[in-house]
């Protein structure tokens, strides 16, 4: 648990920038939670560096991270999920830098999945649906979702829609006819827990119908 220097042999190491960031994922593997940390500078020599978390744990003082290439990772049931933990970068027993972090404020949800788009000819709209593993979770159940879509030819012209449900209706008249669209979705905690956007879901591609000249409406696909 020591956060103090035991000797003076690490002066060079102390000149380096050991700033890091972390995110937590709750109930990511059954009832197990995970915590992932990484250095912000990709050029940090991580050879002898370890991460340790102390405090706000169940019946243990501290836990050590596992190193997985450039990231440091813990999977455990032992997060109290209240209050701040002390997360330190260490060389041996010496702490190089520490951060006090409340794991409930750095939650990164799992990416949504099973994104699909169904065209309803009679309603002249597209029903977007997707799934999230968080519907089954005890903790991070309430999410805000960000659905982003674009015409495939418009490289960076994304339209975003925020919603709390897993279903969205896009009106046909708001989309270009006979065009290929890409759509994707991500999630962020929206109640009690705070944190970061999930990774994007895999993209789904759909084509809008042609305009029917006699009625001025789009043809179904």
């Amino acid at each position: 648990e020591s956060g103090y220097a035991q000797n003076g042999d690490l002066e060079d190491a102390e000149l380096d920038d050991y700033s890091f960031s972390c995110y937590s994922q709750l109930e990511v593997n059954g009832s197990q939670h995970s915590l992932t940390c990484a250095f912000e500078d990709p050029d940090v020599n991580i050879t002898n560096l370890e991460f340790e978390i102390c405090g706000a744990l169940v019946e243990v003082k501290c836990l050590n991270f596992r190193k997985l290439q450039e990231i440091y990772f813990i999977e455990t049931k032992k997060f109290l999920l209240i209050g701040k933990s002390n997360i330190c970068v260490k060389v041996g027993e010496k702490s190089l830098t520490c951060k006090k972090i409340d794991l409930t404020t750095i939650v990164k949800p799992e990416a949504p999945f099973d994104l699909s788009v169904v065209y309803r000819e009679g309603a002249n709209d597209f029903v977007v649906t997707f799934n999230t593993s968080h519907l089954q979770k005890k903790y991070v159940k309430v999410l805000m979702h960000d659905v982003a879509y674009r015409q495939e030819k418009d490289e960076n012209k994304w339209t975003h829609v925020n919603l709390s449900s897993t279903k969205l209706t896009l009106l046909q008249r708001k989309l270009q006819p006979a065009a290929m669209y890409e759509i994707k979705v991500r999630s962020i905690p929206d109640h009690y827990f705070k944190g970061f956007w999930s990774e994007w879901s895999p993209s789904y591609y759909f084509r809008t119908p042609e305009i029917n000249n006699s009625s001025g409406e789009m043809d179904p696909i």
């Epitope: 648990e1 020591s2 103090y4 102390c54 405090g55 169940v58 019946e59 501290c62 209240i82």
Partner: antibody, heavy 119, light 105 residues
Framework: QVQLVQSGAEVKKPGASVKVSCKAS????????MNWVRQAPGQGLEWMGL????????SYNQKFKGRVTLTRDTSISTAYMELSRLRSDDTAVYYC????????????WGQGTTVTVSS | EIVLTQSPATLSLSPGERATLSCSAS?????MHWYQQKPGQAPRPLIY???KLASGIPARFSGSGSGTDFTLTISSLEPEDFAVYYC????????FGGGTKVEIK
């Protein structure tokens, strides 16, 4: 103001159980841990365990594990400590104490509940 | 489990004198807290995270230390300061020291 009010004194026989309550007011009950600390007559302080009122997760001092059970009722902002298989050396004042999660010290204490174990 | 040893067990001083209370840990501790307890009362927090004054605590109280050695200092004792003082480690299992009684000489 922030307050913790504990239930009254108890007299129990060896082998029995006791359940002490701690009613919180003046703050968001689910935002802080509730800790239990005991003090035998003329002795020091001994941490027994804590509960996270938000999710019911508990952490116990190994010395008491298996004998102490911490629970809470969020609807009435009340925490409970039950100690079973009582012995005479469990005679003590039992305190509930709010845990400040930023610094992990006990910033608000109940008035204490005296539990006497005697045959 | 870390053992916290407080010394001296009893400190006999007069009002106006300086009190220095020690807390020694059996292994390194990141943060230490201090509490005051008067007879028949619950403990009350004095100092948290080594040197930060708890709410409502006068500035004559101060804390210092690192690693295994921590100190609570009362710069000039007031009559209401005669009590028992406990140190406590910040992390599981939140161990308390045995206490130092500050009594009137």
């Amino acid at each position: 103001q922030v307050q913790l009010v504990q239930s009254g004194a108890e007299v129990k026989k060896p082998g029995a159980s006791v359940k002490v309550s701690c009613k919180a007011s003046g703050y968001t009950f689910t935002g802080y841990t509730m800790n239990w600390v005991r003090q035998a007559p003329g002795q020091g302080l001994e941490w027994m365990g804590l509960i996270n009122p938000y999710n019911g997760v508990t952490s116990y001092n190994q010395k008491f594990k298996g004998r102490v059970t911490l629970t809470r009722d969020t609807s009435i902002s009340t925490a409970y400590m039950e100690l079973s298989r009582l012995r005479s050396d469990d005679t003590a004042v039992y305190y509930c104490a709010r845990g400040d999660g930023n610094y992990w010290y006990f910033d608000v204490w109940g008035q204490g509940t005296t539990v006497t174990v005697s045959s | 489990e870390i053992v916290l040893t407080q010394s001296p067990a009893t400190l006999s001083l007069s009002p106006g004198e300086r009190a220095t209370l020690s807390c020694s840990a059996s292994s390194s501790v990141t943060y230490m807290h201090w509490y005051q307890q008067k007879p028949g009362q619950a403990p009350r927090p004095l100092i948290y995270e080594i040197s930060k004054l708890a709410s409502g605590i006068p500035a004559r109280f101060s804390g210092s230390g690192s690693g295994t050695d921590f100190t609570l200092t009362i710069s000039s004792l007031e009559p209401e300061d005669f009590a028992v003082y406990y140190c406590q480690e910040w992390n599981y299992p939140y161990t308390f020291g045995g206490g130092t009684k500050v009594e009137i000489k």
